[in-house]
């Protein structure tokens, strides 16, 4: 039975040209995390393997930085970066947990961080 929950940074916004940290946190489970994947729609941005550490997808290596922790930092943001991002926790024995973050990249300085929320 999957008892864990993923807390994410929720709906967030940031300025074009700036950077943003995407964060997820898995709680309420004793399952061992074997790998965390970060995906944008159907594209794999990066993985953090429990044994072998961070691997940044070659197509994103100039604009994506690992961390902090299991989070991911997106740099040099463009309007095209607006959209859904997913953190996918591969665990055993529970299986897979997925968290969702929606990022809006704004032209001006009206960007504000949204509230945190939980996905069971």
């Amino acid at each position: 039975m999957m008892t864990g929950t993923i807390e994410t940074t929720g709906n967030i916004s940031a300025e074009k040209g700036g950077s943003i940290i995407l964060q997820c946190h898995l709680s309420s489970t004793t399952a061992q995390v074997t790998q965390v994947n970060w995906e944008q729609q159907d594209q794999l941005l990066a993985i953090c393997n429990a044994d072998l550490g961070w691997h940044i997808s070659p197509s994103f290596k100039d604009r994506v930085a690992p961390g902090p922790g299991l989070g991911l930092t997106l740099q040099s943001l463009t309007v095209n970066d607006t959209g859904e991002y997913f953190c996918i926790y591969h665990t055993y024995p529970d299986g897979t947990y997925t968290g969702r973050i929606f990022l809006e990249v704004l032209e001006s300085s009206v960007a504000e961080h949204g509230a945190r929320f939980q996905i069971p």
Partner: antibody
Framework: QVQLVQSGAEVKKPGASVKVSCKAS????????ISWVRQAPGQGLEWMGW????????KYAQKLQGRVTMTTDTSTSTAYMELRSLRSDDTAVYYC??????????????????WGQGTMVTVSS | DIQMTQSPSSLSASVGDRVTITCRAS??????LNWYQQKPGKAPKLLIY???SLQSGVPSRFSGSGSGTDFTLTISSLQPEDFATYYC????????FGGGTKVEIK
């Protein structure tokens, strides 16, 4: 085609070191992890550890910690396994093996789809 | 570390027989279980990964099932080239193999 080619057989004295090489071809070396597995004569398979060819990070089996070092040379697409302070019970065939899934498949499965031909290491005085 | 127990350690069978090999994990490993075939003097060959996925190029007479702690490799109709030793391997770090099952000609 995709293959891993290992260095030749070695005979070593107890206390010595051995370094086995594993040259990859036919795929993007840095997109996969390489594991090392050994098999003593007439015995089963033992996982020794693995290395990311992307970033060089390693994880070793607890019983070999401190005696084994795994490295890669991305310029030649070659993985290396060095075992130090050899004992007679290190006599085995040593295999390198590629992880089934590339890092960019999103799932590093810890299953081994491509294997080297094996390198026999004999430790004897 | 997770221990993998394979049974039987050896078996005798005839061409055309249905053969079943079992593997039990000392704790739940979800579907992190792989099966290999090894012939004398050769490297192991991956047959099944993630408990039930058939590796590319492997004949469909091989199948895998199970999850949690109990897993099975089935050869639906044994062929002459199938006489070999079979190993299960769990891929939860640190990875461990079962002791092997030798399939011999009856």
């Amino acid at each position: 085609q995709v293959q891993l080619v290992q260095s030749g057989a070695e005979v070593k004295k107890p206390g010595a070191s051995v370094k086995v090489s594993c040259k990859a071809s036919g795929y993007t070396f840095t997109s996969y992890a390489i594991s090392w597995v050994r098999q003593a004569p007439g015995q089963g398979l033992e996982w020794m550890g693995w290395i990311s060819a992307y970033n060089g990070n390693t994880k070793y089996a607890q019983k070999l910690q401190g005696r084994v070092t795994m490295t890669t040379d991305t310029s030649t697409s070659t993985a290396y396994m060095e075992l130090r302070s050899l004992r007679s019970d290190d006599t085995a065939v040593y295999y390198c093996a590629r992880d089934l899934s590339s890092f960019w498949s999103g799932d590093v499965l810890g299953a081994f789809d491509i294997w080297g031909q094996g390198t026999m290491v004999t430790v004897s005085s | 570390d997770i221990q993998m127990t394979q049974s039987p350690s050896s078996l005798s069978a005839s061409v055309g027989d249905r053969v079943t090999i079992t593997c039990r994990a000392s704790q739940s490993i979800s579907s992190y279980l792989n099966w290999y075939q090894q012939k004398p003097g050769k490297a192991p060959k991956l047959l099944i990964y993630a408990a039930s996925s058939l590796q590319s190029g492997v004949p469909s007479r091989f199948s895998g099932s199970g999850s949690g702690t109990d897993f099975t490799l089935t050869i639906s109709s044994l062929q002459p080239e199938d006489f070999a030793t079979y190993y299960c391997q769990q891929s939860v770090p640190p990875r461990t193999f079962g002791g092997g099952t030798k399939v011999e000609i009856k």
